[in-house]
């Protein structure tokens, strides 16, 4: 496209009911004027979800989207919403393209875009072809995230992207893992990100004409120690008919190695709280998270002296976390119900 | 809905030192970059200091730098500005605020008075 | 001295479109987002258009922003008397690690 070409949908009427998509590449420096719905009836402009004011360098007005010059940030996705609806009618998105000029300043310009033409492309310095996937600057990340830095970019000739760490080359050889530096995505991957990877990462963009550069900084944050979270309602309440089997569930979330105990509420001398205001408990199991079942306590052909109140306490280096469930036990019913219902046992 | 509460503000002779809080509520303050901005008697805003999520980077004005220190709280939501050797060019309306992503402060306190004279 | 340069004032009649400016260099402006704020008397700073162009919900579509190079332009079209503040670009700075603002415009409406 030539630079004094504008881009234009034309003619300015109402579109037809089915939304036009479609991706549009434009000149840096080049108007562009759009048009959606009929000038009286016009629909509002919006980018990025944002409505496009009727006055400025780049504005919306009576149904025209209209860019004095393009610059590469004005590249990216552009609605057009009917009038008092939420109604697409147009939607679009501009790409930033380098300019071109005609070795022949008489030649038709509509020539420009039969690709079989020749081209000459001015030499241009590197600009930022997708600035709007560079807006987030200050990335904190937990620690074993994967992080990904982007700085798309083009130029004549093709820029080359290099990345700087804290001001110095990075290659990542000193880090574990490494890093994947994809050149045709522009972009710096980290996997597993740890504290020392905190810092401010430049991309370097050049090429024989200039430069350009964006810095990213890093904060990895470090899982804050905890004790135990158990999942809510777990284990649950139970009743169980006498002779079946029941399972309590306790599910456990920890960084640090938790350590789990199933313990059953006891009456001793009447009593169910010592002196010290504890309960008396007797533990049936005890285990790491990493012992197999640890987190189901089973109880096989359970009688009226199973039923009670069962707990099951978490504990890491940090703190101890528990929940109760009780366990209800029904007397056999007689054969006639049992029948109807062979599935005994429920949950509450 | 976000806020941030300064205290902690008051009358200081030079010299002296203060230690202002910004208690903040209505986000997860942990992720985020935070900052002082200071503005002076009729003048403008002022950046006085940022510091990272982790509390473990911290950034400071010219103008302030080795006098003042930035730290957090996570687990408090709280962040802080401890002023040391206070001089009278320091008094001015002290605000805290949120750092977008983006570089800019989305959120702001209602600002505390710090004044220093003798 | 701010790192940014504002004009110190600006002023225009009620219906009118005002623009004001902004300047700075690549390690801020050049390179960086420009964000605009409102404050309006003895209140404290509001954000009014962040990465250049963008309004937080709630600011009117009278506020657009645009950012070119190293400088940045803040316009009010159909101005009115509550628009009467100061105003003050921003951009975060890289060789600082943190935000510069422009010295303030004070807009007075006629």
């Known amino acids: 496209l030539e630079a004094s070409e504008e881009v234009e949908l034309e003619p300015c009427l109402a579109p037809s009911l089915e939304q036009q998509e479609q991706e549009l590449t434009v000149a840096l420096g080049q108007p562009v004027r759009l048009c959606c719905g009929r000038a009286e009836r016009g629909g509002h402009w919006y980018k990025e979800g944002s409505r496009l004011a009727p006055a400025g360098r780049v504005r919306g007005w009576r149904g025209r989207l209209e860019i004095a010059s393009f610059l590469p940030e004005d590249a990216g996705r552009y609605l057009c919403l009917a009038r008092g609806s939420m109604i697409v009618l147009q939607n679009l998105t501009l790409i930033t393209g380098d300019s071109l000029t005609s070795s022949n300043d008489d030649e038709d310009p509509k020539s420009h875009r039969d690709p079989s033409n020749r081209h000459s492309y001015p030499q241009q310095a590197p600009y930022w072809t997708h600035p709007q996937r560079m807006e987030k600057k200050l990335h904190a990340v937990p620690a074993g995230n994967t992080v990904k830095f982007r700085c798309p970019a083009a130029g004549n000739p093709t820029p080359t992207i290099r990345w700087l760490k804290d001001g110095q080359a990075f290659h990542g050889e000193n880090r574990i893992g490494g890093i994947r530096l994809r050149h045709q995505h522009w972009s710096l991957v980290m996997e597993s990100v740890v504290p020392s990877d905190r810092g401010t990462y430049t991309c370097l963009v050049e090429n024989a004409v200039g430069s350009i550069r964006y810095n990213y900084l890093l904060d990895v944050l470090e899982r804050s120690p905890h004790r135990p979270i158990l999942q809510a309602g777990l284990p649950a309440n139970t009743t169980a008919v006498v002779g079946s089997d029941v399972e309590l569930l306790c599910k456990v979330y920890s960084d640090a190695q938790p350590h789990i105990q199933w313990l059953k509420h006891i009456v001793i001398n009447g009593s169910s709280f010592g002196a010290d205001g504890f309960p008396y408990v007797q533990v049936l199991k005890t285990a790491d998270i990493n012992s197999s079942e640890v987190e189901v306590l089973y109880l096989r052909n359970v009688s009226a002296e199973d039923a009670g109140e069962y707990t099951c306490l978490a504990g890491n280096s940090i703190g101890l976390s528990y929940q109760s469930a009780w366990l209800t036990v029904l007397p056999e019913e007689d054969p006639t119900w049992t029948a109807a219902a062979p599935e005994a046992r429920y949950t509450d | 809905e976000v806020q941030l509460l300064e205290s902690g503000g008051g009358l200081v002779q030079p010299g002296g030192s203060l230690r202002l809080s910004c208690a903040a509520s209505?986000?997860?303050?942990?992720?985020?970059?935070m900052g002082w901005v200071r503005q002076a008697p009729g003048k403008g805003l002022e950046w006085v200091s940022v510091?990272?999520?982790?509390?473990?980077?911290?950034d400071y004005a010219d103008s302030v730098k080795g006098r003042f220190t930035i730290s957090r709280d996570n687990s408090k939501n709280t962040l802080y500005l401890q002023m040391n050797s206070l001089r009278a060019e320091d008094t001015a309306v002290y605000y805290c605020?949120?750092?977008?992503?983006?570089?800019?402060?989305?959120?702001w306190g209602q600002g505390t008075l710090v004044t220093v004279s003798s | 001295q701010s790192e940014l340069t504002q004009p110190p004032s600006a002023s225009g009649t009620p219906g009118q479109r005002v623009t004001i400016s902004c300047s700075g260099g690549?390690?801020?402006?050049?390179?960086?987002?420009a964000h605009w704020y409102q404050q309006l008397p003895g209140t404290a700073p509001k954000l009014l258009i962040y990465?250049?162009?963008q309004r937080p919900s709630g600011v009117p579509d009278r506020f657009s922003g645009s950012k070119s190079g190293t400088s940045a332009s803040l316009a009010i079209s159909g101005l009115r008397s509550e628009d009467e503040a100061d105003y003050y670009c921003?951009?975060?700075?890289?060789?600082?690690?943190?935000?510069?603002f422009g010295g303030g415009t004070k807009l007075t409406v006629l």
């Open positions: 605020a949120r750092v977008h992503p983006a570089g800019h402060n989305d959120h």
């Open positions: 209505g986000f997860t303050f942990s992720p985020y970059w």
């Open positions: 510091i990272w999520p982790s509390g473990g980077t911290t």
């Open positions: 690549y390690s801020n402006m050049g390179s960086n987002y």
């Open positions: 990465n250049n162009n």
């Open positions: 921003a951009a975060w700075d890289d060789s600082l690690s943190g935000p510069v």
